[in-house]
């Protein structure tokens, strides 16, 4: 029960996290104009990974895409790559984890296979979360560097009457969305890895023991209630020794229409 809950929760947390990573990647507010030095501006600038926008006081917003690949800073390209890798890994992880969920039965899939898939998706979520956190952090670092550089340059060239106020940019909403989403994906991945340990069959060796009764020759094997007792055909019966503790509803039977959720 705890394993199912952990796995399910890990999946949901990762799902929210990946949705957040996608949202952050698409958002335009990665960097927003710092209004501390110029709080009276009637034009508000903000930038994303894919385009830069200007919002005028009328509410009119104009966005222009970065229609160049080679002309963009290497750091921006790196951030884009990290976010895309994070999304791709996260999406694959989600796909894998859906089939790994304990509550979903697909054919006669073994628990060991589900455990492996859970671990795989968990690792994918962890890497996905780390990619997002790394991408956002690289961008944030770039902003901080540029912020202080522009602050140093801000008061230069003011010898005459004319002033040129340089636009400085600070952290946008997308950075916080990205950090939180990356963290959630990471947590979800860890939970999936923890759930995997509970799913994996334990290496418990129960030796087959033969009991020779005087009247009958019935061999009790790890397979459960079989041999000549008449229970062999009842595949729904609870198995006694099968490596790990299971409840009746977890016993795999031949696929039926109810097995595919």
């Amino acid at each position: 029960m705890a394993v199912t809950a952990c796995q399910g929760l890990g999946f949901v947390v990762s799902l929210i996290g990946i949705a957040g990573i996608i949202a952050a990647t698409c958002m335009d507010q990665w960097s927003t104009q710092d209004l501390y030095n110029n709080p009276v501006t009637a034009v508000f600038n903000y930038q994303g990974l894919w385009r830069s926008c200007v919002r005028e006081s009328s509410g009119f917003t104009e966005c222009r895409g970065y229609f160049t690949l080679l002309g963009l800073p290497a750091m921006l390209q790196a951030v884009r790559a990290l976010m895309i890798v994070g999304i791709v890994l996260g999406a694959i992880g989600l796909l894998v984890s859906i089939f790994a969920l304990k509550c979903i039965r697909i054919g006669s899939m073994e628990d060991s296979a589900k455990a492996n898939m859970t671990l795989t998706s968990g690792i994918m979520f962890i890497v996905s979360g780390l990619c997002a956190i790394a991408g956002v952090s690289v961008f944030a670092n770039m902003l901080v560097t540029n912020f202080w550089m522009s602050t140093a340059n801000m008061y230069t060239g003011m010898g005459g009457m004319v002033q040129t106020v340089q636009t400085r940019y600070t952290f946008g909403a997308a950075l916080f969305v990205g950090w939180v989403a990356g963290g959630l994906t990471l947590i979800g991945g860890v939970m999936m890895c923890i759930a995997c340990r509970g799913l994996a069959p334990e290496e418990t060796n129960y030796k087959a023991v033969s009991y020779h009764a005087s009247g009958h020759s019935v061999a009790y094997k790890p397979g459960g209630f079989k041999a000549s007792t008449g229970f062999g055909s009842n595949t729904k019966n609870k198995k006694i020794y099968d490596g790990g503790a299971r409840t009746e509803d977890e016993v795999q039977s031949y696929p039926s229409k109810h097995d595919y959720v």
Epitope: A42, N45, V54, S58, E62, V162
Partner: antibody, heavy 120, light 113 residues
């Protein structure tokens, strides 16, 4: 057709208050910010402030802060400019002007103006 | 506050001649985000409210004759009337649309010689 119709001329005594109205028609009232600008006789234009009829947000020129209040009545598509503690230098023609949506923050339509005379 | 300075204060030209009005701002009106200049030009005839002629330093408002042209960037702007007509007699104002408080130039009075 966009129209901004302002209230009639006012004569006030120093220290009194005046409330000028500007009724908008021909467009969606809440979609456009309304600015107020004044012009003293024979002088240039001076920006007073603006009101956003959508959310009642306002911004004032520091020069007038504390003395000017901009309000709006959505039901009648009217904006009001109230100026208190009037002095003789407040004698001017007061204009309401609509901020254009795609005009780079420029005012595309203006009211006919309201002359406010402050005299003892 | 951004100070807008117009020159000349008054201008007298003959009908059909070119008129040039200059406007200088104390701070750049060029927005780095979209490389647009936030400056407008207005025409005010006696007893009338101002009328928008040019916005964004160079974009003509709809209905404005094409003899009116705006140019310039950053801190220096120009309004040019290529062939002055009798109905162009008015006071012309430039306006900072970039930062609050919005400020206007002192005005340039155009007369016919």
């Amino acid at each position: 057709e966009v129209q901004l119709v302002q209230s009639g001329a006012e004569v006030k005594k120093p220290g009194a208050s005046v409330k000028v109205s500007c009724k908008a028609s021909g467009y969606t009232f809440t979609s456009y910010i309304m600015h107020w600008v004044r012009q003293a006789p024979g002088q240039g234009l001076e920006w007073i402030g603006y009101i956003n009829p959508y959310n009642d947000g306002t911004k004032y020129n520091e020069k007038f802060k504390g003395r000017v209040t901009l309000t709006r009545d959505k039901s009648t598509s009217t904006v009001y400019m109230e100026l208190s503690s009037l002095r003789s230098e407040d004698t001017a023609v007061y204009y309401c002007a609509r901020l254009g949506f795609t005009t780079r923050n420029a005012m595309d339509y203006w009211g006919q103006g309201t002359l406010v005379t402050v005299s003892s | 506050d951004i100070v807008m300075t117009q020159s000349p204060d008054s201008l007298a030209v003959s009908l059909g001649e070119r008129a040039t009005i200059n406007c200088k701002s104390s701070q750049s009106l060029l927005n780095s985000g979209n490389q647009k200049n936030y400056l407008a030009w207005y025409q005010q005839k006696p007893g009338q409210p101002p009328k928008l002629l040019i916005y964004g330093a160079s974009t003509r408002e709809s209905g404005v004759p094409d003899r009116f042209t705006g140019s310039g960037s950053g801190t220096d702007f120009t309004l040019t009337i290529s062939s002055v007509q009798a109905e162009d007699v008015a006071v012309y104002y430039c306006q900072n649309d970039h930062s609050y408080p919005f400020t206007f130039g002192q005005g340039t009075k155009l007369e016919i010689k």
